[in-house]
C-alpha cells in the first residue's frame, strides 16, 4: 500500500509547486522502510556496493560536472543547475568557459579553470581548505572539498558568490539519490538537507540512508554486521 501526501512546496525556481510524496506503507503497520534501514535491517546496498546505485551516483556526478550557477536577474537568489534548466531571459548562467575562468593558482595565471562556477563556492574566496600550494582544488567541481571558512568579505564582486543561495544537496529515498533542492522541498520529501555543502558530490547519501556506523570509506558500503543485527 502507498500513502500519498500532496503539498505546495517552494521549489528551486522560487515558486510554490504542488508536490507529491509517496511513501510505501509497512504491510504490518510498523516503521517505514527508511526507519527499518536505520535500525539495521538487511539492506544490501548498505552491506556491499550496489551496481544500480553506483551507476546512479556516477550519472549524477557527470551531470554535476557540467553544471553552473543560475543567478536570477531580479536578485531573488541562485541555484546550481544545468544550462537547460536556467532561464535565458530571467537569469544569468555563470559557467566558466573560453578562458573566462579564474587561474588554477596565482603561481600560474595562464592555466584557467573550466569546471564551475559553483553557487557560493569559489577557490579564490575559500580560506579553509585554501586552494594553494600542494592542495590546489582540481579543475573538476565534483572533486572539490566542502569550504568550511569563507574569506571575510560581505561582497566578493562575483555573481555566483554574492547571490542568495536557494538550494543545497538533499539526500532523498532509500536509493541514496541526491538533488539540489530548497530546504522546504527536502523536508517535505523526508530527505536529509546538507546545509554545509554546495554540491551533491560533496555528500554521501547512502551513508546517511544506512545510518548506524559511518562507512570507513564514504564511497564503499561496509556494514556486514547487519547480517547479525536483524
Amino acid at each position: 500500500a502507498q500513502h500519498v501526501t500532496t503539498q505546495l512546496v517552494l521549489r528551486n525556481k522560487g515558486v510554490y509547486e504542488s508536490v507529491k510524496y509517496i511513501q510505501q506503507e509497512n504491510f504490518w503497520i510498523g516503521p517505514s522502510s527508511i526507519d527499518l534501514i536505520h535500525l539495521g535491517a538487511k539492506f544490501s546496498p548498505c552491506i556491499r556496493k550496489d551496481q544500480q546505485i553506483e551507476q546512479l551516483v556516477l550519472r549524477e556526478r557527470d551531470l554535476e560536472r557540467d553544471s553552473g550557477c543560475c543567478v536570477q536577474n531580479d536578485h531573488s537568489g541562485c541555484i546550481q543547475t544545468q544550462r537547460k534548466d536556467c532561464s535565458e531571459t530571467l537569469a544569468t548562467f555563470v559557467k566558466w568557459q573560453d578562458d573566462t575562468g579564474p587561474p588554477m593558482d596565482k603561481s600560474d595565471l595562464g592555466q584557467k579553470r573550466t569546471s564551475g562556477a559553483v553557487c557560493h563556492q569559489d577557490p579564490r574566496t575559500c580560506e579553509e581548505p585554501a586552494s594553494s600550494g600542494a592542495h590546489i582544488w582540481p579543475d573538476d567541481i565534483t572533486k572539490w572539498p566542502i569550504c568550511t571558512e569563507q574569506a571575510k568579505s560581505n561582497r566578493t564582486g562575483f555573481l555566483h558568490m554574492d547571490c542568495q543561495i536557494k538550494g543545497r544537496p538533499c539526500c532523498i529515498s532509500t536509493k541514496g539519490s541526491c538533488e539540489i533542492t530548497t530546504r522546504e522541498y527536502c523536508e517535505f520529501m523526508h530527505g536529509y538537507f546538507h546545509e554545509e555543502a554546495t554540491l551533491c558530490s560533496q555528500v554521501h547519501c547512502l551513508d546517511k540512508v544506512c545510518g548506524l556506523l559511518p562507512f570507513l570509506n564514504p564511497e564503499v558500503p561496509d556494514q556486514f554486521y547487519r547480517l547479525w543485527l536483524s
Partner: antibody
C-alpha cells in the same frame, strides 16, 4: 578606508640601490587573497608592473627586472618594501604602490606615487 | 609577455560625445582585462574589471566590452571631468602588463 603611501628618496645616483617603502592602512596584509606591489611610470610613458607580495608570503617579480628587485613585507607595521639595485637614469619614474587581489589580479587601490630621479 | 596595444594614443572630444577606446592583446586573454583612469598628476583608478564588470562608485557612463584579443572602453555622454589617460591591463598571465595609454582631451 583604504590608503597607501609611498616614501623614499627623490634622487638617487646611478649604480646606487633604491629602497622604497609603502605604508598602508584600512586593510591587513595577513588577509586572505590580498597583496601589495609596485608599479612604475616613467614621465609621459606607460605603467610597468614591477613586483607583488601576497598575504601568504608568495612573491612575484617582473622577469625583465627580477635580478634587481627584492620585495618584502612587515605585516605588523603595515609596510611593504621594494629595493632596486644598480639604478640607471632609465629607472627615473613615478613609483606607485598598489593593492592587488587574487579575485581578479587588478589593482583596486593605489598610492599617490613618488617621483624618483636617477642622476649623477 | 603579453603586449597590450591601445588606440588611439590621443583623442580630443567634446562634452556629451560618446567615446570608445580600444585595447588589443597580442594573444587571447579571455576576459582577464581591466581598465584604469589616470587624471593629470594623480594615481590610476580602477574603472572596469574582467572586461565588462563595473566597479562600485564608478559612474554608469563607463562601460567595457570584448573578449579574446579585442576590448573596448566606452564613455557615454562624456563629461569635462573625464579628461584623463586611460590604461588597459591584462591579468591573463604574469607579468601583468599595461597598454601604453590613451589620452583624452576635452575640447
Amino acid at each position: 578606508q583604504v590608503t597607501l603611501r609611498e616614501s623614499g628618496p627623490a634622487l638617487v645616483k646611478p649604480t646606487q640601490t633604491l629602497t622604497l617603502t609603502c605604508t598602508f592602512s584600512g586593510f591587513s596584509l595577513s588577509t586572505f587573497a590580498l597583496g601589495v606591489g609596485w608599479i612604475r611610470q616613467p614621465p609621459g610613458k606607460a605603467l610597468e608592473w614591477l613586483a607583488h607580495i601576497w598575504w601568504d608570503e608568495d612573491k612575484y617579480y617582473n622577469p625583465a627586472l627580477k635580478s634587481r628587485l627584492t620585495i618584502s613585507k612587515d605585516t605588523s607595521k603595515n609596510q611593504v618594501v621594494l629595493t632596486i639595485t644598480n639604478m640607471d637614469p632609465v629607472d627615473t619614474a613615478t613609483y606607485y604602490c598598489a593593492r592587488i587581489t587574487t579575485y581578479y589580479y587588478g589593482m583596486d587601490y593605489w598610492g599617490q606615487g613618488t617621483l624618483v630621479t636617477v642622476s649623477s | 609577455e603579453i603586449v597590450m596595444t591601445q588606440s588611439p594614443d590621443f583623442q580630443s572630444v567634446t562634452p556629451k560625445e560618446k567615446v570608445t577606446i580600444t585595447c588589443r592583446a597580442s594573444q587571447s586573454i579571455g576576459n582577464h582585462l581591466h581598465w584604469y583612469q589616470q587624471k593629470p598628476d594623480a594615481s590610476p583608478k580602477l574603472l572596469i574589471k574582467y572586461a565588462s564588470q563595473s566597479i562600485s562608485g564608478v559612474p554608469s557612463r563607463f562601460s567595457g566590452s570584448g573578449s579574446g584579443t579585442d576590448f573596448t572602453l566606452t564613455i557615454n555622454s562624456l563629461e569635462a571631468e573625464d579628461a584623463a589617460t586611460y590604461f588597459c591591463q591584462q591579468s591573463y598571465n604574469w607579468p601583468l602588463t599595461f597598454g601604453q595609454g590613451t589620452k583624452l582631451e576635452i575640447k
